[in-house]
């Protein structure tokens, strides 16, 4: 790919006009970034700093406990998914700074922007797995005592990752670099060209499997868990449940704009004014979705402070307290049904 003359371009950004004056020279330039892009850059910067440090800390805290603590396995996998996505941020940041120019080649175009979708599917599948675990702890404690183990947890995580990779393939396959003639720019994006139906299908599958279906099932799941918890007057466990609900709710809140704009764009003509407006907001929607990659460590710290009253402990020990405390089911073989029902909620965050 040739390098471009960015320093002194004779041509810049143009206001489209319907008329064509063939004798009008076109030496007009504009190098300012749009407001949505500036906001996206700010969010990317914050997410990268908090996400890399926060998730690295979570990985460090949970990795040592993952052999014996099931909660640690869940949090380790979630943190790895978030951490991986954060690694793409410097590249995405650079691209936006260069007015969406993509100088990183075709392979990077296929892989790096797909990481956020891999994160979305991995996160929601892991959240679903964790929610199923919590549900079983509350409603099937005897089964949990007999079968709930680290091996099964790792298998569940492996299945979640496998499905996530599978669901990310369409985005990966349709990502291409397109070198625009003017303004001279290489763009990284999806190109379905002749197949608008396939584009819509991918967007619908993403909306249903990555958002609507999990939203429905997790809402039902946590409604049952909350009702059971409250009916047992488990005040301690409701605090932890707030962490769980916060993580799940944040997922849906931060993915909502991306999903809505994505489905709308798939049904609109690329030259329509609404499509162009949504396209201008695309980076902002992606950056908003990326907040998911740094929000969990923040939730854990806030929760940890809540449980400790004050932040007296060091950050790693605080996180360890929130993330690796195992449910009563695995700690004691002698228990009553009501004990499990109320106490199993303890630090089963997410």
């Amino acid at each position: 790919m040739d390098s471009f003359n960015y320093t002194t371009p004779d041509y810049g950004h143009y206001d489209d006009k319907d008329t064509l004056d063939l004798n009008t020279p076109v030496d007009k330039t504009s190098n300012t970034l749009r407001v949505p892009d500036i906001l996206a850059l700010v969010i990317f910067a914050v997410v990268f700093l908090v996400g890399v440090l926060g998730n690295a800390l979570v990985v460090w805290v949970t990795a040592f406990e993952a052999k014996r603590t099931i909660n640690a396995i869940w949090f380790l996998n979630l943190a790895v998914a978030d951490f991986l996505s954060c690694l793409a941020l410097p590249i995405l940041f650079t691209s936006i700074v260069q007015h969406h120019h993509w100088p990183f080649g075709g392979a990077a175009c296929s892989i790096l922007p797909s990481l956020i979708l891999l994160n979305m599917y991995a996160s929601i599948l892991l959240l679903a797995t964790i929610s199923a675990d919590r549900f079983l702890l509350v409603f099937k404690p005897i089964w949990c005592q007999n079968f709930r183990g680290a091996g099964l947890a790792w298998i569940a995580c492996a299945v979640a990752w496998g499905l996530a990779l599978l669901l990310t393939i369409p985005s990966f396959l349709y990502r291409v670099v397109r070198e625009e003639y003017f303004p001279p720019k290489v763009l990284c994006g999806v190109d379905y060209s002749h197949d608008k139906r396939r584009e819509r299908a991918v967007a619908i599958v993403r909306l249903v499997l990555g958002f609507l279906w999990p939203l429905l099932t997790l809402t039902i799941c946590y409604t049952f868990i909350l009702l059971r918890t409250w009916s047992r007057r488990a005040t301690r466990s409701t605090k932890t449940l707030k962490v769980v609900v916060a993580v799940v709710a944040s997922f849906f809140i931060f993915w909502l704009p991306y999903q809505v704009t994505g489905i709308m764009m798939s049904f609109l003509e690329p030259s329509s004014p609404t499509f162009l407006l949504l396209k201008k907001l695309d980076s902002l929607c992606v950056s908003f979705a990326y907040i998911n990659c740094c929000i969990n460590p923040i939730i854990y710290v806030v929760a940890g402070q809540g449980f400790q009253g004050r932040l007296r402990k060091s950050l790693p020990s605080l996180l360890r307290n929130v993330l690796t405390e195992e449910s009563v089911v695995r700690e004691s073989k002698s228990f009553t049904r009501s004990t499990v029902d109320t106490m199993a909620q303890k630090t089963q965050a997410v």
Epitope: Y14, K17, L22, P25, V26, F182, S193, K279
Partner: antibody, heavy 121, light 112 residues
Amino acid sequence: QVQLQQSGAELAKPGASVKLSCKASGYTFISYWMHWVKQRPGQGLEWIGYINPRSDYAKYNQKFKDKATLTTNKSSSTAYMQLSSLTYEDYAVYYCARVTGTEGPYYFDYWGQGTTLTVSS
Amino acid sequence: DVVMTQTPLSLPVSLGGQASISCRSSQSLVHSNGNTYLHWYLQKPGQSPKFLIYKVSNRISGVPDRFSGSGSGTDFTLKISRVEAEDLGVYFCSQSTLVPLTFGAGTKLELR
């Protein structure tokens, strides 16, 4: 009015080099990019590349990257294309064309009359 | 590279009749600014190509209204409603959205 006057027909041997010229008049030369297009006998058009006369920045079709070299002379408002290591495949009519448009240089609005390059031993 | 496929390669017409030329691109020609840079040129025998239509459907001044362009994304059409003798020649579609700029193979409009 705008005119692009190209040099006359060229006859060259395989392996040799030729330099085709395109003299512009009737407009400000440095304000418009100049493109070059190849047309083999009875065939379609192939884009070779363009040059920005203001900065002398040239952009090439990868296919012609080692074949063509685009230059300009601002004082004489002339664009040049040098073709090197000629083969029989280079036998064609070569056009220079000016681009314009209100939102960018997207359209070939004026074309030269074409220069026929014959490669023969 | 974007491949521009023109059909038919030869189109016999009667004077006063209608002609329709199709042009299909291998990739979407919608630019990131929302415009579609698909243009049409006419080349008469022994002459340089002449600019007719820009951005799918916009005629340049001096081009009669019997010429009309349409289409979007990857499929485009040039229609000539009442063919006159001066319309005969080779019609090329061209895209200037992506590098390298590419042209169709051409459609020869000739008398039946």
